[in-house]
């Protein structure tokens, strides 16, 4: 299997964060030092992705803090492993009609979730939210990733490789940053417009219509803002 | 084990306002999203709002817009629901539910809320 | 929002009857649907999760079906501790519930 490690590839975009998210709330997927993959109502350090794409639509998940990849077993168990299975761990990208994107195991054929149903992905079907997620770039501070252990000399280059297997913390040549609006800054709630006294776009409904078509800013947020 | 352990029944008047509490334990609070939901002496289940439990951040059904407030006290894992203004028709019990991302799978033992001049 | 209609409001059976709830949307919501049982004075219960998932220790004579609009809770046969009301629930924008099946005793 060529490049099989893909966290030495340097074709990573910078840090993000996959969530789920209704009209209501949201949730970000997070894969734990100890493997376990479930969903926090925030970014949080271990909700810090790394999506490298792949031909043919395919990509491949990694937690930065965990330094584990997005994995499915034949069940559709989603977890967080160090080793590389391209069989389990390389996940078909979908982006739906409503501007969402969907992942599933073209091993498999399950959907990535945060619900605990376990469903297979079929062309044309409509997922339910928790299997929809969107991108959202990371507002986490780097210094966050970076927790060194104290040393009394100057550390080498050698060290910093170790605290910073990913390379994320330092600027590299081939980054490719979320689009600008997919990380647009929203009005918070002192704001006095409209999209501010409803921040969530409760007058105004609840998912975007799947069949709306359409991508850029609405696809890539369709609600003003999450809980 | 998961436990969602909220005050005691309330008589309040008419115009007067109440604050209804539920704490949290067996769980990580900051991970969960928590709603309220009240039911109405015979009634069926309505849906109140929900808090993030980290932002503070709330969302209100629209029936209930400027009238409930939520918050939550991060230290001592227990999130608050007033609602002002009241009425007899908030005569209720009134449940805090944790969310699950699919459903709510705990939920607190009721406050009854009594309004009666 | 999103409404949901339970259908029917209340039934009347008896223990080993095979009970059947529906649930409908107002539009599609994908299976993200949760039934509850509540019994009086209780807090509601959760049953079924993503329309047609178990939860952990709910007996298997339970169990939901449907996606899109249209969805059934299904009681294989009724027991003397299933006499309660079912909700239905939307998880697919807000949170809405059905207006509720009361199930009594015949």
């Known amino acids: 299997y060529p490049n099989a490690s893909p966290l030495l590839g340097s074709s990573w975009g910078g840090l993000i964060h996959l969530y789920t998210a209704t009209a209501r709330n949201s949730y970000h997927l997070q894969i734990h030092k100890n493997g376990h993959v479930d969903g926090a109502p925030h970014q949080t350090i271990y909700s810090a992705l790394m999506i490298r794409s792949e031909d043919a639509g395919f990509v491949v998940i990694t937690g930065v803090m965990s330094r584990r990849y997005l994995c499915m077993d034949f069940r559709g168990n989603i977890f967080g492993s160090h080793y590389f299975d391209p069989e389990n761990c390389r996940f078909q990208h979908q982006t739906l009609e409503n501007g969402y994107d969907v992942y599933h195991s073209p091993q498999y054929h399950f959907l990535v979730s945060l619900g605990r149903a376990k469903r297979a992905f079929l062309p044309g079907m409509n997922p339910p939210p928790y299997s929809q997620f969107l991108s959202r770039r990371n507002e986490i501070p780097l210094i966050h990733f970076n927790t060194p252990i104290p040393r009394r000399h100057t550390q080498s280059a050698e060290d910093d490789s170790e605290r910073d297997p990913l390379n994320v913390l330092k600027p590299r040549a081939r980054m490719t940053p979320a689009p600008a609006s997919c990380s647009q800054e929203l009005p918070s709630a002192e704001d006095n417009s409209p999209m501010a006294s409803d921040p969530l776009g409760v007058v105004r409904g609840g998912r975007v219509n799947t069949h709306a078509g359409g991508t850029g800013p609405e696809g890539c947020r369709p609600f003003a803002k999450f809980i | 084990q998961v436990q969602l352990v909220q005050s005691g029944a309330e008589v309040k008047k008419p115009g007067a306002s109440v604050k209804v509490s539920c704490k949290a334990s067996g769980y990580t609070f900051t991970n969960h999203y928590m709603h309220w939901v009240r039911q109405a002496p015979g009634q069926g289940l309505e849906w109140m709002g929900i808090?993030?439990?980290?932002?503070?951040?709330?969302s209100n059904a629209q029936k209930f817009q400027g009238r409930v407030t939520m918050t939550r006290d991060t230290s001592t894992s227990t999130v608050y629901m007033e609602l002002s203004s009241l009425r007899s028709e908030d005569t209720a019990v009134y449940y805090c539910?944790?969310?699950?991302?699919?459903?709510?799978?705990?939920w607190g033992q009721g406050t009854m809320v009594t309004v009666s001049s | 929002a999103i409404q949901l209609t339970q259908s029917p409001s209340s039934l009347s059976a008896s223990v080993g009857d095979r009970v059947t709830i529906t649930c409908r949307a107002s539009?599609?919501?994908?299976?993200?649907l949760v039934w509850y049982q509540q019994k009086p004075g209780k807090a509601p219960k959760l049953l079924i999760y993503?329309?047609?998932y178990l939860e952990s220790g709910v007996p298997s004579r339970f169990s939901g079906s449907g996606s899109g609009t249209d969805f059934t809770l299904t009681i294989s046969s009724l027991q003397p501790e299933d006499f309660a009301t079912y909700y239905c629930?939307?998880?697919?924008?807000?949170?809405?519930f059905g207006p509720g099946t009361k199930v009594d005793i015949k």
């Open positions: 808090i993030n439990p980290i932002s503070g951040s709330t």
């Open positions: 629930q939307q998880f697919n924008d807000y949170f809405t």
């Open positions: 539910a944790r969310d699950i991302v699919d459903a709510f799978d705990f």
């Open positions: 993503d329309a047609s």
């Open positions: 539009q599609g919501i994908s299976s993200a």
